[in-house]
Amino acid sequence: AITEAREEAKPYPLFPGPFPGSLQTDHTPLLSLPHASGYQPALMFSPTQPGRPHTGNVAIPQVTSVESKPLPPLAFKHTVGHIILSEHKGVKFNCSISVPNIYQDTTISWWKDGKELLGAHHAITQFYPDDEVTAIIASFSITSVQRSDNGSYICKMKINNEEIVSDPIYIEVQGLPHFTKQPESMNVTRNTAFNLTCQAVGPPEPVNIFWVQNSSRVNEQPEKSPSVLTVPGLTEMAVFSCEAHNDKGLTVSKGVQINIKAIPSPPTEVSIRNSTAHSILISWVPGFDGYSPFRNCSIQVKEADPLSNGSVMIFNTSALPHLYQIKQLQALANYSIGVSCMNEIGWSAVSPWILASTTEGAPSVAPLNVTVFLNESSDNVDIRWMKPPTKQQDGELVGYRISHVWQSAGISKELLEEVGQNGSRARISVQVHNATCTVRIAAVTRGGVGPFSDPVKIFIPAHGWVDYAPSSTPAPGNADPVLII
């Protein structure tokens, strides 16, 4: 049967009575050593009758005395079997054994839950020698017990390669409930059920759980640990905690906030990072996410021109990295830009609108209807064209660039001419006779040079030829016109 000793009990006697051989309470031990490294050498002296043996692991010595009497079996004496005490209290327990003095090499070690206790434990082994036996008392003390000290403690002694094991001493450290699982903060959908878990352990058991929501108990009846609370749904933020009760008192878990997912707040601080003729790079600071991660964002772009049709272009992008390059915009145009982001609940309102402008760009099309003809009287080539549509000029025209390439046998030379934006004709001097002149024209704005027109070729004959027809930009599909006069 287990002997229970509670913390308020009187100190346990080390033995049922004095040792045979008249060992008295004032009898000081011959040797008292602190327990270092788990093993303690025992010094043996003259034997007397050993104490009451236990039923555990017993060593039967094979050696006989001078009178050839067989020695009785060696065993640890019975001691208290179960010690119950509160956390942070001190405890001391011991093993005792009487060993015939003929054994010179004995060691006692302490074990807890099958593992040897080594090092800095408070273990002391005391030796009380008598004529034929030495009483050995191995004491183990813990000054302030913790839950981790719970367990089964035994002594082991080795004699002549035989192992003697004591009965276990069960240490049960009791205290307030200890949480092994506490509720976690969550973000939940409005009016949707969710679960919270709370688990606490003793000893002592049982541990009962009460749930608390916004300082009010959810259950007036205790629930055995572990407890799962199904919250039927919330319409507003709430704080939950759980109380764990046992015979020692109660422990309260951390309070956790349960937030209700909502649509996000609109983004703020939409700003222009960079503008080009056809794109605007914007950034924004996301608003509050409504307790639900952002999924994506929508950039809304409106032409700010009061004469525009007011249509809105929408560009969808990922929520990160709060940056987006809006493309396919017109050059030298004004736009209103707003940003909205969404989470699983829905879309935020649109951010405050900001105004942004694209810069001047190089024209996107070449001049049209390019015509070239030879004016032999002045030894010039006359070039005419139509300027590109205003929409596609992508800025204010500052002029044109004319490329004319002269090719004759084995010679090729390209010349560039810049002409002002007024007018749509130019005259260039003939550079080489008996050669082909290839002309291309590009419109120019402050944003750069636009694409060149398709090449128009004219043959410049040797001196003396009279009849010249113009050469012009071909109709589509006529790739390389050559006018030979």
Partner: antibody, heavy 118, light 105 residues
Framework: QIQLVQSGPELKKPGETVKISCKAS????????MSWVKQAPGKGLKWMGW????????TYADDFKGRFAFSLETSASTAYLQINTLKNEDTTTYFC???????????WGQGTTLTVSS | QIVLSQSPVILSASPGEKVTMTCRAS?????MHWYQQQPGSSPKPWIY???NLASGVPARFSGSGSGTSYSLTISRVETEDAATYYC????????FGGGTKLEIN
């Protein structure tokens, strides 16, 4: 299945005592609290109080302190409502109803009609 | 204690109609529960924790609300819905509303 079965109708004289029982079955009796609810003929519901079936501690609504007593016989999974010194106005139907979390009465007894008349 | 006021006291409807009854609390409550009581029977749990239907309650019933204002709605009334409906809170001391009697024409 879960059931709350109440004792039968009672006819009492003013000044007498009555004890109404509510026997629970189909669940662990000590897990759920037990409330008592009064309903006068043709009237609404009025909460009288409850008893903690785990600890046995009763709680009474303000209007039911004094002559009313809740008790338990846990081994029989039974809750009791005792009314002392009966008055004519105690004539009504009494319901037991169990609850756990969020104090929602998920099962009700069939009701016990008490008539107090001289 | 928290007083619950139900309106209307009597509600008449024809089968197929949508009806709503309300329950107002004298101060804010966390959850509202609703019970249905047919004449001569004990109350039955109908809606718990504001919006959750009790076992066996038809999906045409719904509950909503927060703070001090709660409601029970029947999307298409049927004759078997004729009963008295009580709201109930236990945020303070438990109280019941006076009931709304639903009559089917």
């Amino acid at each position: 299945q879960i059931q709350l079965v109440q004792s039968g109708p009672e006819l009492k004289k003013p000044g007498e005592t009555v004890k109404i029982s509510c026997k629970a079955s189909g669940y662990t009796f000590t897990t759920y609290g037990m409330s008592w609810v009064k309903q006068a003929p043709g009237k609404g519901l009025k909460w009288m109080g409850w008893i903690n079936t785990y600890s046995g501690v009763p709680t009474y609504a303000d209007d039911f302190k004094g002559r009313f007593a809740f008790s338990l016989e846990t081994s029989a999974s039974t809750a009791y409502l005792q009314i002392n010194t009966l008055k004519n106005e105690d004539t009504t139907t009494y319901f037991c109803a169990r609850f756990l979390r969020y104090y929602y009465f998920d099962y009700w007894g069939q009701g016990t009609t008490l008539t107090v008349s001289s | 204690q928290i007083v619950l006021s139900q309106s209307p006291v009597i509600l008449s409807a024809s089968p197929g109609e949508k009806v709503t009854m309300t329950c107002r609390a004298s101060s804010s409550v966390t959850y509202m529960h609703w019970y249905q009581q047919q004449p001569g029977s004990s109350p039955k749990p109908w809606i718990y924790a504001t919006s959750n239907l009790a076992s066996g309650v038809p999906a045409r019933f719904s509950g909503s609300g927060s703070g001090t204002s709660y409601s029970l709605t029947i999307s298409r009334v049927e004759t078997e819905d004729a009963a008295t409906y009580y709201c109930h809170q236990w945020s303070g001391n438990p109280t019941f509303g006076g009931g709304t009697k639903l009559e089917i024409n």
